[in-house]
């Protein structure tokens, strides 16, 4: 697995560092998950040639994975800092139960699929420090994911597989996006 | 072979607008970060703007900000920079770019560039 | 707009020397810089890229340090062929680079 952020050879060589600031953390932490979701998207398109198909729009049908528009806030043409972080800090608490999802897809990356997943988590509490307004950030319900997880999980092979290759794509744009927007907090 | 092809330069009066295209092939713009830099004769490089493929979110400098749009057609896998009330200080040769995608943070693929050059 | 601030604008140096250029950023931009290289006539070639990474294929003489504001290139023994201009470039927001070093034969 992966070595989470901060406790990379080169900080560990370089003690006399200083401290990473926390819109700094939040990067690192956000390139960190972005590295592992590359591993895991290469192990994806190396078992399936989902990465090259053009029918992803069958299995998106079943999905409903979270995407930024103009309307949250985050892009540079009506960016408004406190909407935004809202939306990503939902964003990515409606990920969670598609990255649980992932946990049992993957036989020589398990590791780095549960890395992504635990760094998930810590990023959102990072971002959760950083909201005024927790107040407007929406819980996904337990029952309806715990729901969503058995539909997905008994779908066939082929669309599992292409599941699995939306959900990795669709969660490395999403991060992309919120990394960009977060660097003009 | 992975290139970038950019045309519509030309000679425009200030206050005038211009229409700049940029064809890529080798690569899918509908999957990468595309940019444009200009260079004034003689001068330095300078940023304009920067399109992430994802949602077509658009970045520009303070400088242009207002007057250039730039776009993109998946389609025609061709990127455009509409550049409206053009100043004398747009003159430059504009280049169309690509950002590198994982994440190294650097310009890979550049173009030859096209002249623009605003004069009464 | 991030702005970077880069000096010298020009730098005599003969061959063998050991050259600097300075990169400094208005505001912290953690290891997101590169440095490019441009020759009369022709498209920017980068030498480094996350501050201190070497660009495949470029000469180990080259080198890159720095991180948050502060960055620099170091060229460690100037060779003909290095006598060009130079550039940073921040990525952290946008894409703004320095004015540029020119690099002249002394």
């Known amino acids: 697995a992966p070595v989470p952020p901060g406790e990379d050879s080169k900080d560990v060589a370089a003690p006399h560092r200083q401290p990473l600031t926390s819109s700094e953390r939040i990067d690192k932490q956000i390139r960190y998950i972005l590295d592992g979701i590359s591993a895991l998207r290469k192990e994806t398109c190396n078992k399936s040639n989902m990465c090259e198909s053009s029918k992803e729009a069958l299995a998106e049908n079943n999905l409903n994975l979270p995407k930024m528009a103009e309307k949250d806030g985050c892009f540079q043409s009506g960016f408004n800092e406190e909407t935004c972080l809202v939306k990503i800090i939902t964003g990515l608490l409606e990920f969670e139960v598609y990255l649980e999802y992932l946990q049992n897809r993957f036989e020589s990356s398990e590791e780095q699929a549960r890395a992504v997943q635990m760094s998930t988590k810590v990023l959102i509490q990072f971002l959760q420090k950083k909201a005024k307004n927790l107040d407007a950030i929406t819980t996904p319900d337990p029952t309806t994911n715990a729901s969503l997880l058995t539909k997905l999980q008994a779908q066939n092979q082929w669309l599992q597989d292409m599941t699995t290759h939306l959900i990795l794509r669709s969660f490395k744009e999403f991060l992309q996006s919120s990394l960009r927007a977060l660097r003009q907090m | 072979e992975v290139q970038l092809v950019e045309s519509g330069g030309g000679l425009v009066q200030p206050g005038g607008s211009l229409r700049l295209s940029c064809a890529a092939s080798g690569f899918t713009i509908s999957s990468n970060y595309m940019i444009w830099v200009r260079q004034a004769p003689g001068k330095g490089l300078e940023w304009v703007s920067d399109?992430?493929?994802?949602?077509?979110?658009?970045y520009y400098a303070d400088s242009v900000k207002g007057r250039f749009t730039m776009s993109r057609d998946i389609s025609k896998n061709t990127v455009y920079l509409q550049m409206n009330s053009l100043r004398a200080e747009d003159t430059a040769v504009y280049y169309c770019?690509?950002?590198?995608?994982?994440?190294?943070?650097?310009?890979?693929?550049w173009g030859r560039g096209t002249l623009v050059t605003v004069s009464s | 707009d991030i702005q970077m601030t880069q000096s010298p604008s020009t730098l005599s140096a003969s061959v063998g020397d050991r050259v600097t250029i300075t990169c400094r950023a208005s505001q912290g931009i953690s290891s997101w810089l590169a440095w490019y290289q441009q020759k009369p006539g022709k498209a920017p070639k980068v030498l480094i890229y996350k501050a201190s990474t070497l660009e495949s294929g470029v000469p180990s003489r080259f080198s890159g340090s720095g991180s948050g504001t502060e960055f620099t290139l170091t060229i460690s023994s100037l060779q003909p062929d290095d006598f060009a201009t130079y550039y940073c470039q921040q990525s952290w927001l946008g894409g703004s680079f320095g004015q540029g070093t020119k690099l002249e034969i002394k």
């Open positions: 770019a690509r950002w590198e995608e994982e994440g190294r943070g650097y310009i890979d693929v």
């Open positions: 399109l992430y493929y994802y949602a077509g979110d658009t």
